[in-house]
Amino acid sequence: LIIGFGISGRHSITVTTVASAGNIGEDGILSCTFEPDIKLSDIVIQWLKEGVLGLVHEFKEGKDELSEQDEMFRGRTAVFADQVIVGNASLRLKNVQLTDAGTYKCYIITSKGKGNANLEYKTGAFSMPEVNVDYNASSETLRCEAPRWFPQPTVVWASQVDQGANFSEVSNTSFELNSENVTMKVVSVLYNVTINNTYSCMIENDIAKATGDIKVTESEIKRRSHLQLLNSKAS
């Protein structure tokens, strides 16, 4: 969490941002809140990015003002216009790119004063893994697949029964480049699986950590997946 304050010479207002991560090719949110004003026409929101000449986005007098927007952000940004009045200056970003990573500044002017806060935005690719029994294999085998990751993650297998066991000798992980030549499909195979056990396939890079669990018994198979972003720190 980054809390920024205003510039001297005028009353300062508190602006708060939250570091976040964007999934490339999808939409992202850059979070920013501020002390609200009672009049929308008095609020100015400017989003800037370090190293970029043009503005990321500008909202003033109750509407978008995009004449100074940088070329790389044209047609890609929007604020939640109906929430500005309650102090939400968060920015929606379409079609997140690797190059969108960096330091952003959320700069606010209201009738009460000015304020700003920085936000670190990471970009990459992350997706939920799915673990299945590979019935084509000669022995009991599990196959963990996740369609989109970047940068290349690590894959670690674990089991409930053999806690702390190292499965690297009995697993094989491959990374296959997707058609857009950036993200990769992750496939990891675990051999010599025993029944009545819960196995976890954990995929992690510096942006996200995802886990796919599978419980195999003689009568049923249960699956569960979850994904967690690693760098959501508020400022």
Partner: antibody, heavy 123, light 112 residues
Framework: EVQLVQSGAEVKKPGSSVKVSCKAS????????MQWVRQAPGQGLEWMGA????????RYTQKFKGRVTLTADKSTSTAYMELSSLRSEDTAVYYC????????????????WGQGTLVTVSS | DIVMTQSPDSLAVSLGERATINCKSS????????????LAWYQQKPGQPPKVLIY???SRESGVPDRFSGSGSGTDFTLTISSLQAEDVAVYYC????????FGGGTKVEIK
């Protein structure tokens, strides 16, 4: 290879509506704005509006607001332009077009065009 | 809305000679931060969709012959064909993308 293939020619009565389709291939349909431009016979080009298929966001020029509806079907990678309350002056070739990618932005210059769909409005 | 005005409406030029088309916008198309002017030039031949030649006032689209060049900034822009070829006979349009999009009325280029 980026391709935009439009539906065939239409003849419509005044007061009716027309729906022109534009099927996209060779790129990720959801992450590029689709633009619509028309050209009356022997006349210049006129931008009508645009849709972002990923979330259905639209932009329209003032002249066509309320009369044109842009939609997109993600499952078939097809964009649609529907023009209602047709009049004779709507007789034109209607084009869909897509911008060149620039660092994730496709709100750029129109590098890819459909072949055009002739809509004739006549009683 | 931004109005784009092209001149002349038509132009007859001898093969190998220079052709110059002008485009004027009703307000500045210059982004004061990036110093880019949001103007593009298109070529349209009969029965075909337009083809982009120039973007950001002076950047040539890939594959476009270098006899085509764009210049200007703010409100006044020029497309120059340095040595007209037979295949350059077409209608040329300017288009602003500073605020949504607007095309100019077009300039027809013929051989004298």
């Amino acid at each position: 290879e980026v391709q935009l293939v439009q539906s065939g020619a239409e003849v419509k009565k005044p007061g009716s509506s027309v729906k022109v389709s534009c099927k996209a291939s060779g790129y990720t349909f959801t992450t590029y704005w689709m633009q619509w431009v028309r050209q009356a016979p022997g006349q210049g080009l006129e931008w009508m509006g645009a849709i972002y298929p990923g979330d259905g966001d639209t932009r329209y020029t003032q002249k066509f607001k309320g009369r044109v509806t842009l939609t997109a079907d993600k499952s078939t990678s097809t964009a649609y332009m529907e023009l209602s309350s047709l009049r004779s002056e709507d007789t034109a070739v209607y084009y869909c077009a897509r911008g060149r990618d620039y660092s994730g932005s496709s709100w750029t210059w129109f590098a890819y065009w459909g072949q055009g769909t002739l809509v004739t409005v006549s009683s | 809305d931004i109005v784009m005005t092209q001149s002349p409406d038509s132009l007859a030029v001898s093969l190998g000679e220079r052709a110059t088309i002008n485009c004027k916008s009703s307000q500045s198309l210059l982004n004061s931060r990036t110093r880019k002017s949001y103007l593009a030039w298109y070529q349209q031949k009969p029965g075909q969709p337009p083809k982009v030649l120039i973007y950001w006032a002076s950047s040539r689209e890939s594959g476009v012959p270098d006899r085509f060049s764009g210049s200007g900034s703010g409100t006044d822009f020029t497309l120059t064909i340095s040595s007209l070829q037979a295949e350059d006979v077409a209608v040329y349009y300017c288009k602003q993308s500073y605020n949504l999009y607007t095309f100019g009325g077009g300039t027809k280029v013929e051989i004298k």
